[in-house]
Interface confidence: medium
């Protein structure tokens, strides 16, 4: 069952999922000047069986001007830089560490993908929050939100997190302290 709305917004914080429950949809969004191919899938879908989950269907973008360029290749380094790279890389590194039954990892980028990923979460999904760079986390409880079904309606639990000015960004569960680059995540929501 899809969650009716987005996870709660926390001032000066971003959220992301460690892994995505089966049924999660990722919109096939293309960057400006590109569009999804006409015969292409509207979205990618986390699907699978009891032993293995993966993203079904691939997103494909083509130039709005061109008609027949439907190839799908791994983005070149310069193309990847157009994305919010630190955000994506930290998500994918974290996703590589997990293999939860009934969950998918972060999907790899596709050529000419839009800068922001739009996810549609399902009931039971957990997202984790961290303060953006320059803000410190004050925890009163779990810095996470879970989409739950109550009385036939979906709702997200409220994360117990306050982000106050100064110091390093807090880390997501299982994430190593950055060795070389203390950049943290950019100031934008990582998943929607």
């Amino acid at each position: 069952e899809l969650c009716d709305d987005d996870p709660p917004k926390i001032t000066h914080a971003t959220f992301k999922a460690v892994a995505y429950k089966e049924g999660t949809m990722l919109n096939c969004e293309c960057k400006r000047g590109f569009r999804r191919i006409k015969s292409g899938s509207p979205y990618m879908l986390c699907t699978g069986n009891s032993s293995h989950s993966s993203w079904d269907n691939q997103c494909q973008c083509t130039s709005s001007a061109a008609r027949n360029t439907t190839k799908q290749v791994t983005p070149q380094p310069e193309e990847q830089k157009e994305r919010k790279t630190t955000e994506m890389q930290s998500q994918m590194q974290l996703a590589d560490q997990v293999s939860l039954p009934g969950h998918c990892r972060e999907p790899p980028p596709w050529e000419n993908e839009a800068t922001e990923r739009i996810y549609h979460f399902v009931v039971g999904q957990t997202v984790y929050y961290q303060c953006v760079q320059g803000y410190r986390a004050l925890h009163r409880g779990p810095a996470e939100s879970v989409c739950k079904m109550t009385h036939g309606k979906t709702r997200w639990t409220q994360p117990q997190l306050i982000c106050t000015g100064e110091t390093e960004p807090s880390q997501f569960p299982g994430e190593e302290e950055p060795q070389a680059s203390p950049d943290g995540l950019p100031e934008s929501e990582t998943s929607r």
Epitope: L2, T24, N27, G40, S41, L45, I118
Partner: antibody, heavy 118, light 111 residues
Framework: EVQLVQSGAEVKKPGESLKISCKGP????????IAWVRQRPGKGLEWMGI????????RYSPTFEGHVTLSADMSLTTAYLQWSSLRASDTAMYYC???????????WGKGTMVTVSS | QSALTQPASVSGSPGQSITIFCTGT?????????VSWYQQHPGKAPKLMIY???KRPSGVSNRFSGSKSGNTASLTISGLQAEDEADYYC??????????FGGGTQLTVLS
């Protein structure tokens, strides 16, 4: 609870134009695909096409392509189905529906009855 | 793009089980697990009953179940009740990134 609210019934003459609407929720309208489905009196459901309001990408059933146009206005969180020249055979109930997970239509409008008669 | 094939009508007595079949091709039903079933009462909008071949949305009775074999999907309603009397439609995603519905099956619950 997410709802799709459709415009009211219409009575038109053959050759006239028409635009019916389907209003969705403000917070998520531009993130979901909206499909249109026709049901002629006493008949079954026919898939007409689907549109993504986020960028107005539209896909059509071959049966309906060229006869109807799908559009959307994100600022009004509304999807539209329009005809430039109606035929008597367009008389039907028209439903809009949200494309949910697993490629199923999980939320439906109540329908708009279109009657085309001279 | 041909409609999926369903029987025009089926009937059963209260408490019985009935199965509605939906036959397509390898380009729709057989090629994807994206088969869904809808219930429509007279004068009402369709309601999603089964998605992804066999999954039930919350709020749908577990008397409704779905399955698929090859190019044919099926909807089974067990413990038939009077309120199950309605039209039932199958639908599938297709290889051309469109959707197709079945012609519909009228279920009559005999009294």
């Amino acid at each position: 609870e997410v709802q799709l609210v459709q415009s009211g019934a219409e009575v038109k003459k053959p050759g006239e134009s028409l635009k019916i609407s389907c209003k969705g929720p403000e917070y998520s309208f531009n993130r979901y695909w909206i499909a249109w489905v026709r049901q002629r009196p006493g008949k079954g459901l026919e898939w007409m096409g689907i549109i993504y309001p986020g960028d107005s990408d539209a896909r059509y059933s071959p049966t309906f392509e060229g006869h109807v146009t799908l559009s959307a206005d994100m600022s009004l969180t509304t999807a539209y189905l329009q005809w430039s020249s109606l035929r008597a055979s367009d008389t039907a109930m028209y439903y809009c529906a949200r494309l949910g997970s697993y490629y199923a239509f999980d939320i439906w409008g109540k329908g708009t009855m279109v009657t085309v008669s001279s | 793009q041909s409609a999926l094939t369903q029987p025009a009508s089926v009937s059963g007595s209260p408490g019985q089980s009935i199965t509605i079949f939906c036959t397509g091709t390898s380009s729709d039903v057989g090629g994807y697990n994206y088969v869904s079933w809808y219930q429509q009462h007279p004068g009402k909008a369709p309601k999603l009953m089964i998605y992804d071949v066999s999954k039930r949305p919350s709020g749908v009775s577990n008397r409704f179940s779905g399955s698929k074999s090859g190019n044919t999907a099926s909807l089974t309603i067990s413990g038939l009740q009077a309120e199950d009397e309605a039209d039932y439609y199958c639908s599938s995603y297709t290889s051309s990134s469109t959707w197709v519905f079945g012609g519909g099956t009228q279920l009559t619950v005999l009294s």
